[in-house]
Interface confidence: low
């Protein structure tokens, strides 16, 4: 009889075990386990009748179509086999065990005790057949296995082969290389690859296979497994396969489709092709004179572009427009998009005018083109060039005049200070004095009401500043409330500055009338004590410097006592009369402590920002109307005049033991330079 066993494990015993089995007996056990398992059979006890080639009693182990083992006897001999420690493994999930005894047993045989169990099949190790094994990776689990693919591959629906997604490859460049996936390694199986070359209309694609060409083939049937097809419009070229690459293909089209098909088997290395766009040829190009074209090629085809540029110092000129470069393109009809432009020498054009300066051309015909040279110089003797710059400018390749130090910036002509054209021949006085010679005090400024009435003096600093006394720029304060308010200040539009003035009221051709832009009183000015009695007036425009108008120099250091200074102005003379012309006096600087002692009885403080000058016996002094005017001294080594002070205050005019007090410019020089930016 037959016993069907479906468990994952079990025990099989000879009939009557452990007693002796009966004669003339046959039992078959059919063991079936799930797919993915095999059956392992082993015996714990085996005792059957011995016979030659197990003719009498036996245990036969088999599958559907194969005998795995036949056992009998008690121990293995030349002609019979017992299982002993041997394990019988079924190749599949089925095993059949048949026990048979013949009609007689000469002895008592106890039979067998066998055990079986389902054991997992490791398909990954055991599958040799390419048609069944995993293409890339195999993963075993109890009862089965599965396949997976390398990065970039997709598992085919057969759950075994690995394909690639390659149906969306677009090529738009004019040249390129296309290969089978993974080239030169074997191409993937079960794949449908599509490569599209899509170029601009006017191009024609040429294909050429290179290097290795290895696509699975068949000796009789043309390309039944793997192949390449090339589709150009309605026309299909191919299929191509084997080891011989197709000849170069001229498609005569700007749009080409390449199809590559692979089946689920084979290990071929694939293919590689290069493509190139061809177009109409354009005529040869000649670079312009003083220029070049890039790239320089023997031949130019559709879509080739060339850049026309010029040598250093030249500019591309196209339709009267100057540019750095000009691009032209080979069109599909074989003509160039534009004519080659010309190269025109860079022109820096007329150089910028230099305030208070002149331009001289170093190159012939006053050329202003590339590498031409000009020289700026200042209007001497009234202006000099800042930092002693050479003033030489060259026309650069960029079309701008360039100086080695200043670059494209123009030089600066600074006013020359303290060097009058006319030198003094005699000394004169203001209070108790004689007229000054015309042009010997070119820095003096007259502060005048708009009706022409002068009210103070001042000195020209740099090209657009007047230094004067702070008390000149406000109304007299109420003794009951001596606070300086904005409303007390003179508005810039309320007065004017006259430079080059000699006569007090009469005009002459040397005068320059200038408006006021802004006034700045010293931040520490005290109208009650006259401390820091200094102010700066910014002119709306710079005066023209000449023999009668020139700035004074700021002091280089402190003033020595006893030094002779000159004070100038249009202030009152004896008998409260005003002079007709500018007057001046020459007086000595007085020791500071002497001056302090002189004013102590009057309870007037002479502070460190003040400097005194005059003679002990009096007589020579500044007076009303001279306020703000210059007190200067001559540096004999340099022949240059320097500002020492500005007329400020005093007890009456020219009194014995009552010196003139001046705002000390050296003390406030830093403030003056900070506000005006003036340097000597």
């Amino acid at each position: 009889h037959t016993v069907e066993l479906n468990n994952m494990f079990g025990q099989i015993q000879s009939p009557g075990y452990p007693d002796s089995y009966p004669s003339d007996s046959e039992v078959t056990w059919n063991i079936t386990v799930p797919d993915g398992f095999r059956i392992k059979l082993y015996f714990m006890h085996f005792n059957l009748e011995s016979s030659y080639l197990c003719e009498y009693d036996y245990v036969k182990v088999e599958t559907e179509d194969q005998v795995l083992a036949t056992f009998c006897g008690r121990e293995t001999t030349d002609t019979e086999q017992t299982p002993g420690q041997e394990v019988v493994l079924s190749p599949g999930s089925f095993m059949s065990i048949t026990f048979r005894s013949d009609f007689s047993n000469e002895e008592r045989f106890t039979g067998f005790d066998a055990h079986y169990m389902a054991v997992d099949v490791d398909e990954c190790k055991e599958r040799e057949d390419e048609e069944l094994s995993c293409d890339h990776y195999c993963h075993n689990y109890i009862g089965g296995y599965y396949c997976s693919c390398r990065f970039g591959y997709i598992l085919h629906t057969d759950n075994r082969t690995c394909r690639v997604e390659c149906s969306d490859n677009l090529f738009t460049q004019r040249t390129g290389v296309i290969t089978s996936p993974d080239f030169p390694n074997p191409y993937p199986k079960s794949s449908e690859c599509l490569y599209t070359i899509e170029l601009e209309e006017g191009f024609m694609v040429n294909l050429q296979f290179e290097d290795i060409f290895d696509i699975e083939d068949h000796p009789e049937v043309p390309c039944p497994y793997d192949y390449i097809k090339i589709k150009v419009g309605p026309k299909v070229l191919g299929p191509f396969c084997g080891e011989k690459a197709p000849e170069p293909i001229s498609t005569q089209s700007h749009s080409v489709l390449i199809l590559f098909h692979s089946d689920n088997s084979g290990e071929n290395r694939g293919w590689r092709l290069s493509y190139r766009a061809a177009g109409n040829e354009c005529p040869e190009l000649q670079p312009p004179v003083h220029g070049k074209i890039e790239p320089s090629q023997a031949k130019y085809f559709f879509k080739d572009q060339v850049l026309v540029s010029c040598d250093t110092g030249y500019k591309v000129l196209k339709d009267n427009v100057e540019m750095d470069t000009f691009q032209i393109e080979c069109l599909k009809d074989g003509t160039w998009s534009n004519k080659i432009p010309t190269c025109k020498i860079v022109d820096c054009r007329a150089p910028g005018e230099l305030e208070h300066g002149l331009i001289t051309f170093s190159t012939r015909n006053n050329l202003t083109t590339y590498k031409s040279e000009i020289k700026y110089s200042c209007q001497e003797p009234y202006y000099k060039m800042l930092n002693n710059n050479t003033g030489i400018y060259t026309c650069s390749a960029q079309g701008v005049w360039m100086n080695k130090v200043l670059g494209r910036s123009l030089p600066t002509c600074l006013p020359v200070c303290g060097l009058p054209k006319f030198s003094r021949k005699l000394m004169a006085r203001i209070f108790n004095g004689r007229p000054a010679q015309k042009g010997t005090t070119p820095w003096i400024a007259m502060l005048s009401h708009l009706n022409g009435q002068p009210f103070c003096g001042g000195s020209l600093l740099g090209s657009s500043w007047i230094v004067t006394a702070a008390h000149c720029l406000h109304q007299s304060l109420d003794p009951e409330d001596p606070t300086l308010r904005d409303s007390d200040l003179l508005s810039p539009s309320d007065f004017k500055i006259i430079l080059g003035k000699h006569w007090r009221l009469r005009s002459d051709e040397n005068e320059q009338h200038l408006g006021v832009k802004h006034t700045t009183l010293h931040p520490q000015y005290d109208p009650n004590t006259f401390e820091n009695d200094v102010a700066l007036v910014e002119l709306l425009e710079s005066p023209v410097l000449n023999a009668f108008v020139m700035p004074i120099c700021l002091p280089e250091g402190p003033q020595q006592e006893g030094a002779m200074v000159i004070v100038s102005g249009w202030g009152k003379q004896f008998l409260q009369r005003f002079p007709e012309t500018l007057m001046e006096i020459e007086i000595p600087i007085v020791d500071h402590s002497t001056c302090q002692k002189a004013y102590a009885p009057l309870k007037k403080k002479v502070t460190r920002d003040m400097i005194c000058a005059g003679e002990k016996e009096g007589g020579k002094d500044a007076c009303a109307g001279d306020s703000g005017g210059p007190m200067v001294t001559l540096n004999r080594e340099r022949g240059q005049w320097y500002l020492v002070g500005t007329v400020s205050w005093g007890d009456d005019c020219g009194k014995k033991d009552r010196y003139g007090v001046y705002s000390y410019i050296h003390h406030n020089k830093d403030w003056i330079q900070r506000v005006t930016g003036v340097r000597n």
């Epitope: 004017k496 009338h513 408006g515 425009e541 710079s542």
Partner: antibody
Framework: AVTLDESGGGLQTPGGALSLVCKAS????????MGWVRQAPGKGLEWVAG????????RYAPAVKGRATISRDNGQSTLRLQLNNLRAEDTGTYYC????????????????????????????????????WGHGTEVIVSS | ALTQPSSVSANPGGTVKITCSGD???YGWYQQKAPGSAPVTVI????NRPSNIPSRFSGSKSGSTATLTITGVRADDNAVYYC?????????FGAGTTLTVL
């Protein structure tokens, strides 16, 4: 009082020539730079020409350069504007104008005039200002 | 060239600003109440006001743009306002801005 009287306007033919005269009084004519300003019908003001106090420096607007001549006679206190090759666009009111202060000059680009606070109307700019204006003379260029 | 708006409007007592852009350093503002009438300067040198002009008129300049500001606008401020500038060789006027007091 400052007065400026223009004359010489009227109907002119295209291509012809025009001579405007301005007679000045009430100020020292020889100390003032002078100028001409015009206003086309329904349009804004347009500076035409200017001259130094001594007549040595002249300047012209691009629209009239090469066709206009400004001159003065300090002895007679008169200012002239000669305009040749007349065009339709020269039509308008032409004003004679006096500068704000004596000594204003075109010769030096840095010189400046300033306007006084004398209550008179004044037009000031960085390089040139007109303080007094004539009533204008109308010029029509038409065929 | 000087660029200014062609027209602006303001309510009586309000404030109005007129701008003028060019490439000059100094600008003037000039009022003409009717074509053919004598011009009147309201501002010169960007910020200065002649003494006969009320303080309601003020000028300012930022970069290359000048601005005329009229505060407390009155009906008799109705006029065309021209900005002007002069370089070393010529004088230029803007096209004018018509101020309408509503």
């Amino acid at each position: 009082a400052v007065t400026l009287d223009e004359s010489g306007g009227g109907l002119q033919t295209p291509g012809g020539a025009l001579s405007l005269v301005c007679k000045a009084s009430g100020f020292t004519f020889s100390s003032n730079a002078m100028g001409w300003v015009r206003q086309a019908p329904g349009k804004g003001l347009e500076w035409v020409a200017g001259i130094d106090d001594d007549g040595s420096g002249t300047r012209y607007a691009p629209a009239v350069k090469g066709r206009a001549t400004i001159s003065r006679d300090n002895g007679q206190s008169t200012l002239r504007l000669q305009l040749n090759n007349l065009r339709a666009e020269d039509t308008g009111t032409y004003y004679c104008a006096k500068t704000c202060e004596p000594g204003t000059t075109f010769k030096d680009k840095c010189n400046t005039c300033r306007c006084g606070s004398d209550g008179k109307s004044a037009f000031c700019t960085r390089k040139l200002c007109y303080q007094a204006w004539g009533h204008g003379t109308e010029v029509i260029v038409s065929s | 060239a000087l660029t200014q708006p062609s027209s602006v409007s303001a309510n009586p007592g309000g404030t109005v600003k007129i701008t003028c852009s060019g490439d000059s350093s100094y600008y003037g503002w000039y009022q003409q109440k009717a074509p053919g009438s004598a011009p009147v300067t309201v501002i010169y040198d960007n910020t200065n006001r002649p003494s006969n002009i009320p303080s309601r008129f003020s000028g300012s300049k930022s970069g290359s743009t000048a601005t005329l500001t009229i505060t407390g606008v009155r009906a008799d401020d109705n006029a065309v306002y021209y900005c002007a500038s002069t370089d070393s060789s010529s004088t230029a006027f803007g096209a004018g801005t018509t101020l309408t007091v509503l």
